[in-house]
């Protein structure tokens, strides 16, 4: 049976290992893990340093302030910027919508409201824990970079997990594994000691003793409900058949635009409809 955390413990930012407790994920505090930790201490600095505060100040760039509307993602080009638009939007800045509330564009239980002006055919009001113009993005708790020593942060929905680089271990990759020193696993694999010998836990898309062999990510047909699997630089990507969403097309989309996501699917996080 699932653990019953302290009453009121934030399901997004807190978790428990014993009944009645409420332990906070990094970046959150308070008895119920509802208070964000102040970011004024420059936890994730980027850009040139400020002489007055010691904090790093971002340099200006064409994607600053994200010129892409409606949840479009901005990428810098040699001369300017380029917007990659979500489903149903197009135009230089993703400002043109070809979708209305009748198409059920709001995911994860988002409430669709018709737009007040011609440039926005609809607006999605997202439930807590989701964001984006279509409520397609789970709030990114990895942005505070909780994984140390270059570990890869994974937001599993019910908890954060760190995938550690070779030579490091622990919930936040805080432990240095001296036994694996000089025995690195290739392609982002993690070295694990066992019986005096080292073993590699390989990153997605790789296999073999030292993770040097490229695996076929689509071999096991991971995309459910007729989803089409493509090998991708990050492992694999699923193109979901209409009516399904999630990283592996595992979640049905209801006609009203909501999806049948379990409250906290074990080991999974509800993903973008196509990826």
């Amino acid at each position: 049976a699932p653990l019953v955390c302290r009453a009121g413990c934030s399901p997004e930012h807190g978790f428990c290992e014993q009944p009645g407790e409420c332990r906070c994920l990094e970046g959150w505090t308070g008895p119920l893990c509802t208070v964000p930790v102040s970011t004024s201490s420059c936890l994730s600095p980027r850009g040139p340093s400020s002489a007055t505060t010691g904090c790093l100040v971002p340099g200006p760039g064409p994607c600053d302030g994200n010129p892409c509307a409606n949840g479009g993602s901005c990428s810098e080009t040699p001369r300017s910027f380029e917007c990659t638009c979500p489903r149903g939007f197009y135009g230089l800045r993703c400002e043109v919508s070809g979708v209305t509330c009748a198409d059920g564009p709001c995911f994860n239980g988002g409430l669709c409201v018709g737009g007040a002006d011609p440039d926005s055919a609809y607006i999605c009001h997202c439930p807590p824990g989701f964001q984006g113009s279509n409520c397609e993005k789970r709030v990114d708790r990895c942005s505070l970079q909780p994984c140390r020593n270059g570990g890869l942060c994974l937001d599993l929905g019910h908890a954060l997990r760190c995938r550690c680089r070779a030579g490091f271990a622990g919930p936040r990759c805080e432990h240095d594994l001296d036994d694996c020193a000089g025995r690195a696993c290739a392609n982002g694999g993690t070295c694990v000691e066992g019986g005096g010998a080292h073993r590699c836990s390989c990153a997605l898309g790789f296999g073999g003793r030292d993770c040097r062999e490229r695996a076929d990510p689509c071999a096991a047909r991971p995309c459910a409900h007729g989803g089409r699997c493509y090998a991708h630089f990050s492992g694999l990507v699923c193109a979901c058949a209409p009516g399904y969403m999630g990283a592996r097309c595992e979640f049905p989309v209801h006609p009203d635009g909501a999806s049948a996501l379990p409250a906290a699917p074990p080991g999974l996080r509800p993903g973008d409809p196509q990826r």
Epitope: T84, R87, G88, Y90, G91, G98, V99, D103, R214, D216, P217, C218, A219, A220, R221, G226, R228, C229, Y230, A231, H232, V237, A239, A241, P242, P273, Q274, R275
Partner: antibody
């Protein structure tokens, strides 16, 4: 340099069979989404036939009209074949091999094509 | 599913603009899974536009795709002699299986 080359085309009699081969160079199918066949009758438009997963799953998709008479398969990490049976004069066409890639949440993007091989069905 | 292209042929002078329409009998996958190809005689097609409006690698910005759902347009501005070709739209669909269809093609004549 990434390339596709079709082979196996030629003259075949009605009700005959033929197997076309698509050979890739510069890349491996396993990292390339799907491999597909598209045909074009002389002076006519393009017609999608079938696709097969570049990986080991062997998943396939066929146009409704091609099911039964046409069969796509992957014979190695760089070759795909199209077996055609019960051929008729209407199957006379240039047959192209094309690579289908996933870009920005869209699929069936044929970003690499072979030069094509001509199949003529005639008695 | 049927993709209907109009008009064909279409002609314009060098430096001019042509617009090709592609009407789908049913909405394409994700409302934007439509591509445009250019084909010259004796050559295989070349991908110009994917995701209805995104320019493929190496394609000049004179080519512009737009539309969503069932109605799509390819606009070629500042026409050059080299743009003389046949242009095809291609839609992707799912109905108990994935499949793709091409429009009938539109020949562009540059005067």
């Amino acid at each position: 340099q990434e390339q596709l080359v079709e082979s196996g085309g030629g003259l075949v009699q009605p009700e005959g069979s033929l197997t076309l081969t698509c050979t890739a160079s510069g890349f491996s199918f396993s990292s390339s989404g799907y491999m597909c066949w598209v045909r074009q009758a002389p002076g006519k438009g393009l017609e999608w036939i079938a696709c097969i997963s570049g990986g080991s799953s062997g998943d396939t998709d066929y146009a409704n009209w091609a099911k039964g008479r046409f069969s796509i398969s992957k014979t190695s990490s760089t070759t795909v074949t199209l077996q055609m049976t019960s051929l008729t004069v209407a199957d006379t066409a240039t047959y192209f091999c094309a690579r289908d890639v996933y870009i920005d949440s869209t699929i069936f993007n044929f970003n690499l094509w072979g030069p094509g091989t001509l199949v003529t069905v005639s008695s | 599913q049927v993709l209907t292209q109009t008009p064909s042929p279409v002609s314009a002078a060098v430096g001019g603009t042509v617009t090709i329409s592609c009407q789908a009998s049913q909405s394409v996958y994700n409302n934007n899974n439509l591509a445009w190809y250019q084909q010259k005689p004796g050559q295989p097609p070349k991908l110009l536009i994917y995701a209805a409006s995104s320019l493929a690698s190496g394609v000049p910005s004179r080519f512009k795709g737009s539309g969503a759902g069932t109605q799509f347009t390819l606009t070629i501005s500042d026409l050059e002699c080299d743009d003389a070709a046949t242009y095809y739209c291609q839609g992707t669909y799912y109905s108990s299986g994935w499949y793709s269809t091409f429009g009938g093609g539109t020949e562009v004549v540059v005067k």
